[in-house]
Interface confidence: low
């Protein structure tokens, strides 16, 4: 029986996906205006021509750099937050702590946040049926190697004391096959960057436990170390109270550990 | 069909105060950023405000910054402009225009303007 | 503020013939590759009309003869044949920096 669409494994491109990228790139040269230079519509031209007409299994880092270019922007290095399995937490963080920057903080990365998108060899058709898994179909596909080059290159701009934060709840807090553990570890230049400082987020109200002791946080330790960068580790026992107290630094509570 | 009518202009004495308003249609009002530019009598034009779609970003000119107040209701469809402290020189056609769509700071639509008039 | 200053004031040019305007910033209004320099359209008793973006880009449903060209500081919009619904004010913006400024307006008129 031929089939006139490949089926993949994952969920298909988000609905109305081009819609959203152009909307979210106005908003953002609007909020933005140190960006105002971008011009949205290329910028979605640019993202279009990375993976429409193009084997969504097929796809490279070099199908995005004409979006790269187009989305080049300056955070400054030294206030780069990154992390692992704990994104809504860490944009919480980034959005009171205003002058530091998550990859979601930054255009690229706001554009894409949360969205799936492919297309089909040989067709201008964005598939919104299914997009290829990364385990069960390919991990050549649009969406992860778009995350792969943002992160790469977002990791690669970090200088001095870069902060990672980490789910405590999770049996790997540290996992060398997350984007955080298979790309921005090994992208971060030890010429630049001093000191990597890990915050392990706990999750159980009573959960005094000392994770920085965990193994995987002390295999994070020594493949940092190898490459020549200080580690340091911080436990995040109360993030409400953490929230909190970035939010309001004088109040007589935070001074004591949180 | 895209459309921007002003209203709210008039006259009114130096150190008064004047709401504008600008009622948008045709298009999907809360995802453009919108502006209120004037133009003395017989003179050229003056950006004077902008609000971004949410309304977490607002930029003025100096010259009117703590006097006058943009702000917009997106569920009404609807851009103001808040005037104190009036002066002689705030005399002129206020227009709204619509942020072009792909990027900060120029202007596709405009409305037809209304003239606020100073004196006393 | 950047200033702009355009020129000449007015002009008056015969039907059919070719009508330069020129504008010039106070200081660049380039930035990573793009000139955010923008010329607008303004009749009597109407609100101005988008006619250039980015300084070479014409703006959908605007006649051909329109095109614009410079970059940095000095910019120019050209009428190829000038006709007579083409009388009106015209002025540059930028929008590089804020305040977002407008040039003084050139008009032009039937010789």
């Known amino acids: 029986v031929p089939r006139w669409r490949q089926q993949w494994s994952g969920p298909g491109t988000t609905k109305r996906f081009p819609e959203t990228v152009l909307a979210r790139c106005v908003k953002y040269t609007e909020i933005h205006p140190e960006m105002r230079h971008v011009d949205c519509q290329s910028v979605w031209d640019a993202f279009k021509g990375a993976f429409i007409s193009k084997h969504p299994c097929n796809i490279t880092e070099e199908d995005y750099q004409p979006l790269m270019k187009l989305g080049t922007q300056t955070v400054p290095c030294n206030k780069i937050l990154l992390w692992s399995r704990i994104k809504d937490l860490a944009h919480q963080f980034t959005q009171v702590q205003r002058d530091m920057f998550t990859l979601e903080d930054t255009l690229l990365g706001y554009l894409a946040d949360d969205l799936t998108w492919c297309g089909e060899f040989n067709t201008s058709k964005i598939n919104y049926q299914s997009c290829p898994d990364w385990r069960k179909d390919c991990s050549n596909n649009p969406v992860s190697v778009f995350w792969k080059t943002v992160s790469r290159r977002f990791a690669e701009a970090a200088c001095d004391v870069v902060h990672v934060m980490l789910n405590g709840s999770r049996s790997k807090i540290f996992d060398k096959n997350s984007t955080f553990g298979s790309v921005e570890v090994h992208n971060l230049q030890p010429e630049k960057v001093q000191t990597l400082e890990a915050w392990v987020i706990h999750g159980g109200r009573e959960d005094s436990r000392d994770l920085c002791q965990d193994p995987t946080i002390k295999e994070l330790e020594s493949i940092i170390s190898k490459r020549n960068i200080q580690f340091s580790c911080k436990n995040i026992y109360r993030p409400d109270k953490f929230l909190q107290c970035v939010k309001n630094p004088e109040d007589s509570s935070c001074t004591s550990e949180i | 069909e895209v459309q921007l009518v002003e209203s709210g202009g008039g006259l009114v004495q130096p150190g008064g105060s004047l709401r504008l308003s600008c009622a948008a249609s045709g298009f999907t009002f809360s995802d453009y950023g919108m502006h209120w530019v004037r133009q003395a009598p017989g003179k050229g034009l003056e950006w004077i405000a902008f609000i971004s779609t949410g309304s977490s970003n607002i930029y003025y000119v100096d010259k009117v910054k703590g006097r006058f107040t943009i702000s917009r209701d997106n569920a009404k469809n609807t851009l103001y402009l808040q005037m104190t402290s009036l002066r002689a020189e705030d005399t002129a056609v206020y227009y709204c225009a619509r942020n072009y769509v792909s990027s900060y700071g120029y202007f596709d639509y405009w409305g037809q303007g209304t003239t606020v008039t100073v004196s006393s | 503020d950047i200033v702009l200053t355009q020129s000449p004031a007015s002009l008056a040019v015969s039907l059919g013939e070719r009508a330069t305007i020129s504008c010039r910033a106070s200081?660049?209004?380039?930035?990573?590759?793009?000139?955010?320099m923008h010329w607008y359209q303004q009749k009597p008793g109407q609100p101005p009309k988008l006619l250039i973006y980015?300084?070479?880009n014409l703006e959908s449903g605007i006649p051909a003869r329109f095109s614009g060209s410079g970059s940095r500081t000095d910019f120019t919009l050209t009428i190829s044949s000038l006709q007579a619904e083409d009388v009106a004010v015209y002025y540059c913006q930028q929008t590089n920096k804020d305040p977002l400024t407008f040039g003084g307006g050139t008009k032009v008129e039937i010789k």
């Open positions: 200081e660049s209004v380039d930035n990573y590759g793009i000139s955010f």
């Open positions: 980015r300084a070479s």
